[in-house]
């Protein structure tokens, strides 16, 4: 058997670090057998069999000119093997960040903090951390580790499915190359990394007969689970065309009637979402949707379109609008967004 341990990486390649002494090992001989060493394609003897180094070639302070293929021969001139030297660096701890678009799953991505120049792979796992005793500040890794399954096709990402919202996790990402391994540990709480996807299906419609009103409606992001336990709250911004500043409101549900639009001008509207108890951060903004207030006449009745702002409008007084909806709006697929306060309270 070969006296040379096979480092992780392609066969026949041995590895070293620039500026350091490097030992190359002749793979096809018995340990200690004296061999001669040559650079591939060069007749000059690099190290003879009388060096006292047996089957090894020592390169002091290796640099890039030492990279390439080497040939070792036994005393009788037989080929002991060929070795390719590749220089690079041991791994540094990778940089890891984790994010969650819902309260049941999270993903972690990583990048090398330093390029090693060598074949590299990553090992990914996680543990659930549990509280020790009554003192909730004291935590220690307890259950696991479990593998964090990596995306196929070499994307630097792994996903933890079925995570517990109130638990803490310790993520382990280890960078491995032929010169060693280096581990980054990252403590993650779903509550702090939660960032929903932006709301979907944003529509902006005029309100017939009201030249300063626009009705915006949207839906939960498709990635948000259907269970009603964790709701989203929303932030809506709007501005007239060519106007640089956004106006911001926090609607109570999945629609909003803007009452201070500029008559005759198109308006851009966008919405963002966040966990209703302020876990994590606001989503990115949805793509903008556009709408222009109506210029038509006033209808005889007002549909119950939800909470109307009370900014003054140059419009006739009409019956008072529908009562405001509760601020903790359930998931639209489970309760219609016009259901009454009483019905909402049953599920709360």
């Amino acid at each position: 058997s070969s006296p040379c341990p096979q480092a992780w990486g392609p066969p026949g390649v041995q590895y070293g670090q620039p500026g350091r002494s490097v030992k190359l090992c002749c793979p096809g001989v018995t340990a200690g057998d004296p061999v001669s060493w040559f650079r591939d394609g060069e007749p000059k003897l690099l190290q003879g069999p009388d060096s006292g180094l047996g089957h090894e070639l020592v390169l002091a302070q290796a640099d890039s000119t030492d990279e390439g293929t080497y040939i070792c021969q036994t005393l009788d001139g037989a080929l002991g093997g060929t070795v390719t030297l590749q220089l690079g660096y041991p791994p540094a701890r990778p940089v890891v960040s984790c994010q969650a678009a819902d309260y049941e799953n999270f993903s972690c991505t990583w990048s090398p903090s330093q390029i090693s120049g060598l074949p590299t792979r990553y090992l990914t796992s996680y543990r659930k951390k549990t509280v020790l005793g009554a003192d909730s500040q004291r935590r220690s890794p307890s259950t696991g580790p479990w593998p964090c399954p990596q995306d196929p096709l070499g994307a630097a990402r792994c996903v933890v499915h079925g995570a517990e919202f109130w638990s803490q996790y310790r993520i382990n990402v280890t960078e491995v190359n032929p010169l060693g391994a280096s581990t980054r540990l990252l403590d993650v709480s779903l509550q702090s990394i939660l960032r929903p996807d932006p709301p979907q299906g944003l529509r902006v419609e005029s309100v017939p007969g009201y030249p300063r009103r626009l009705r915006a409606s949207w839906t939960y992001p498709a990635s948000w689970p259907c269970q009603p336990h964790f709701l989203l709250k929303f932030r809506l911004q709007y501005r007239p065309a060519q106007h640089p500043a956004w106006s911001t409101v926090e609607p109570a549900g999945l629609e909003e009637v803007i009452t201070d639009a500029v008559a005759g001008l198109p308006h851009a509207v966008r919405v963002s979402a966040r966990d209703f108890l302020d876990a994590g951060t606001w989503s990115t903004w949805s793509p903008e949707a556009w709408g222009t207030p109506s210029t038509g006449t006033i209808p005889k009745e007002i549909p119950a379109w939800g909470q109307l702002h009370t900014q003054p409008e140059v419009e006739p007084q009409v019956d008072s609008p529908a009562p405001p909806r509760p601020s903790l709006q359930p998931h639209p697929r489970l309760l219609d967004h016009r259901d009454s306060v009483e019905q909402v309270a049953v599920l709360a």
């Epitope: 540094a92 940089v95 960040s97 990048s111 090398p112 903090s113 330093q114 390029i115 280096s182 990252l186």
Partner: antibody, heavy 118, light 107 residues
Amino acid sequence: EVQLLESGGGLVQPGGSLRLSCAASGFTFSWYSMTWVRQAPGKGLEWVSSIVPSGGHTQYADSVKGRFTISRDNSKNTLYLQMNSLRAEDTAVYYCAKPEDWGLFDLWGRGTLVTVSS
Amino acid sequence: DIQMTQSPSSLSASVGDRVTITCQASQDINNYLNWYQQKPGKAPKLLIYDASNLQTGVPSRFSGSGSGTDFTFTISSLQPEDIATYYCQQYDNLSPTFGPGTKVDIK
């Protein structure tokens, strides 16, 4: 010679913007994470921001998050710091540094002074 | 963020004296701790990395020790050129933090 050279500092009004550059030479810039560290006059060192070799991960101190953007151009061996909405407390010497393993700063530039004042 | 404290904040010693500075982290940082020297008007210079490793080219009178939360930096025999401010710095996590510094001068 291995070195880092910062530029782009100067006097700017509160609310203004400035872009710092750091030119690297003497090492394989695209293999290393890079960092900005600052030092207010007469004060200690404060880490500002770091970026991985690919540019795919960035990290910011809470004090600058949302206002500063770190970036790099590996083809030009240059690191950048775009500073917006500047405040008086951003007044400092800004150093560019090359870390090993993200946070071990073994090479520093000479620094460039940013003064935010009206 | 991990907080770093240093003591003393300043000290005066005679040439040849042994000087010790301590650094404490608000949580366990393993051995991910570095020590820097900064002279007035100059950039910081790395002296010790990973708590106890001497950076190449740094005189052997500088040394460091410790792990976890408590660390020590020592100048075994203070020299006039060692007048500077010394900073500890952790890099256990992705947001490195520095200690407030210790100013060293000659009596």
